[in-house]
């Protein structure tokens, strides 16, 4: 479970076709 103070930070994960991109790479989303 994320700490409360982390709530509004983006979380970054590896994924494919994410973050408006066609390939695989890191993607950070709030």
């Amino acid at each position: 479970r994320r700490r409360r103070r982390d709530t509004h930070f983006p979380i970054c994960i590896f994924c494919c076709g994410c973050c408006h991109r066609s390939k695989c790479g890191m993607c950070c989303k709030t």
Epitope: K23, G25, C28
Partner: antibody, heavy 121, light 107 residues
Framework: QVQLVESGGGVVQPGRSLRLSCAAS????????MHWVRQAPGKGLEWVAV????????YYADSVKGRFTISRDNSKNTLYLQMNSLRAEDTAVYYC??????????????WGQGTMVTVSS | SYELTQPPSVSVSPGQTATITCSGD??????ACWYQQRPGQSPVLVIY???KRPSGIPERFSGSNSGNTATLTISGTQAMDEADYFC??????????FGGGTKLTVL
Amino acid sequence: QVQLVESGGGVVQPGRSLRLSCAASGFTFSSYGMHWVRQAPGKGLEWVAVIWYAESNKYYADSVKGRFTISRDNSKNTLYLQMNSLRAEDTAVYYCARAQEGIAPDAFDIWGQGTMVTVSS
Amino acid sequence: SYELTQPPSVSVSPGQTATITCSGDKLGERYACWYQQRPGQSPVLVIYQDSKRPSGIPERFSGSNSGNTATLTISGTQAMDEADYFCQAWYSSTNVLFGGGTKLTVL
């Protein structure tokens, strides 16, 4: 100017611990993911760990998982690497590197000068 | 386990085009980056997202990535380009791979 300065390296015996620091300046430290990358003498680059914006969002290479801990103190603009149970194969120059800005930070866009860690009895 | 493979060395004459390859399983499905490391210095990012150049990197550096191979091309190679070059790509959140490096010699 944008700068990363590592410190804390040295000679340490196998099984002992060491903590590396990386002081950042010239940019908003809290707005960037930060990595540790190492390079054994005469060898290539090996990624070690990353800490993203949230303290809970961190990842490690299999070779160091369970032994190394990455952390950051945004109030001090400093990145850390706590290295426990050190082995001879951990001997390397350790670089801190900034992750690229933006929602898709695949690259390491700024590197420090590195600090040498030698594990030897 | 995945790995990225580069030729250990590449030689080129001044003013000619140097081509450095990086091969890996399904590498073209992920974004590749390239770093230059001069002797005794820290790495410098020269290409990201396959073909994009950071500010301050000369136009003679270009990149491409498809299939299983990413390519770094240096046009009009200069003596100052002599260095080690490393490719890099993400294969998972806990697996960032670097190639073994290619030593570029400008004859």
